[in-house]
């Protein structure tokens, strides 16, 4: 499901419960994904010892992941809530290559990898609502996107697996630095 | 294993650094933080380091306290330092099973710093 | 600010009693909260996490549960070991924080 439990509008398992804030809902989905995340993560760190590998620094290379930096106005000192929005929205977009190229890596956590894609797509949505200057906001090009998913597709399986596996603790991290500042806003 | 070092005797005003040295932790997988104890009084929080190496402080720590890391190490920078600074620094690991959630699963056993 | 109120701030409990230690928080965090069990001359060690998982290790005598700003500690069948501080944690925020830390409290086993 790409919202939480209890978050559709057509549940009224709780009539009682006060409706979620807008902020409380962007939480509520970054922490489900999280979870979603931990799950894939348990998957891959199983299958192989890449979790522990050191060598992780020459695949990252090749990876152009987002990654959340002082300028980005998101961490404590020199906090700037548009300029942080923007980034995570931004971050966001460009994450979801390679959600996409997460999806045939998984066994038995197949569902979990498609829901983390759909949560994501849930959450760029959620955040659209609340940025003021969308503007700033630059859409990943499609067709640079289509030769890095080839791109990465054809890599032999050991970098797939390391690939895999950065993509999994970058996203997981810039996920928790977005949830830090959004409880900031 | 985690590690405190650099604790001491020192006068008002005096500077000082403490240093967390970790083995058997990757330190750009795990938050950190530091938490500090005066003589039979509760635990207070100075700061947290996470993995994108974002630092967060305690609103009264702020300005006087600078955490850093390097890839086996956690320091506590202290400046303009008082009597009531008088306390056991403990340094701890935080737990990244789940996947948010600032719980410190690994404590070191303190380095005790004294202002007088 | 995030604030945690930790009550009692000493409690005195027989051998096989249950103690119950409460924390609150100024604003709801979620069920982040940990709870922390210190010994004299010791570092704190991690007992429980986010509400109610207990830390490997820890005897199921410990139970944790609450939601949004109220949570509980309960000890039952406490044992001499069981004497220390106990401190809640607050995981939610580390942005304009005093302390994530509860004031503590004090278990005395009689």
């Known amino acids: 499901a790409p919202v939480p439990p209890g978050e559709d509008s057509k549940d009224v398992a709780a009539p009682h419960r006060q409706p979620l804030t807008s902020s409380e809902r962007i939480d509520k989905q970054i922490r489900y994904i999280l979870d979603g995340i931990s799950a894939l993560r348990k998957e891959t760190c199983n299958k192989s010892n890449m979790c522990e590998s050191s060598k992780e620094a020459l695949a990252e290379n090749n990876l152009n992941l987002p990654k959340m930096a002082e300028k980005d106005g998101c961490f404590q000192s020199g906090f700037n809530e548009e300029t942080c929005l923007v980034k995570i929205i931004t971050g966001l977009l460009e994450f979801e290559v390679y959600l996409e190229y997460l999806q045939n890596r998984f066994e038995s956590s197949e569902e979990q990898a498609r829901a983390v894609q759909m949560s994501t797509k849930v959450l760029i949505q959620f955040l659209q609502k609340k940025a003021k200057n969308l503007d700033a906001i630059t859409t990943p090009d499609p067709t640079t996107n289509a030769s890095l998913l080839t791109k990465l597709q054809a890599q032999n399986q050991w970098l797939q697996d390391m690939t895999t596996h950065l993509i999994l603790r970058s996203f997981k991290e810039f996920l928790q630095s977005s949830l830090r500042a959004l409880r900031q806003m | 294993s985690v590690e405190e070092s650099g604790g001491r005797l020192v006068t008002p005003g005096t500077p000082l650094t403490l240093t967390c040295t970790v083995s058997g932790i990757d330190l750009s997988s795990y938050d950190m933080s530091w938490v500090r104890q005066a003589p039979g009084k509760g635990l207070e929080w100075i700061g947290y380091i996470y993995t994108d190496s974002s630092t967060y402080y305690a609103n009264w720590a702020k300005g006087r306290f600078t955490i850093s890391k390097t890839s086996t190490t956690v320091d506590l920078k202290m400046t303009s330092l008082t009597t009531e600074d008088t306390a056991t620094y403990f340094c701890?690991?935080?737990?990244?099973?789940?996947?948010?959630?600032?719980?410190?699963?690994?404590w070191g056993p303190g380095t005790l710093v004294t202002v007088s | 600010a995030y604030d945690m109120t930790q009550t009692p701030a000493s409690v005195e409990v027989a051998m096989g009693g249950t103690v119950t230690i409460k924390c609150q928080a100024s604003?709801?965090?979620?069920?982040?909260l940990s709870w922390y069990q210190q010994k004299p001359g010791q570092p704190p060690k991690l007992l429980i996490y986010?509400?109610?998982t207990l830390a490997s290790g820890v005897s199921s005598r410990f139970k944790g549960s609450g939601s949004g700003t109220e949570y509980t500690l309960t000890i039952s069948g406490v044992e001499c070991a069981d004497a220390a501080t106990y401190y809640c944690?607050?995981?939610?925020?580390?942005?304009?924080?005093?302390?994530?830390f509860g004031g503590g409290t004090k278990v005395v086993v009689v």
């Open positions: 701890a690991k935080g737990s990244t099973d789940y996947a948010f959630d600032t719980r410190l699963d690994l």
């Open positions: 604003q709801s965090i979620s069920n982040e």
């Open positions: 986010r509400t109610s």
């Open positions: 944690q607050q995981g939610y925020n580390s942005n304009d924080v005093d302390n994530v």
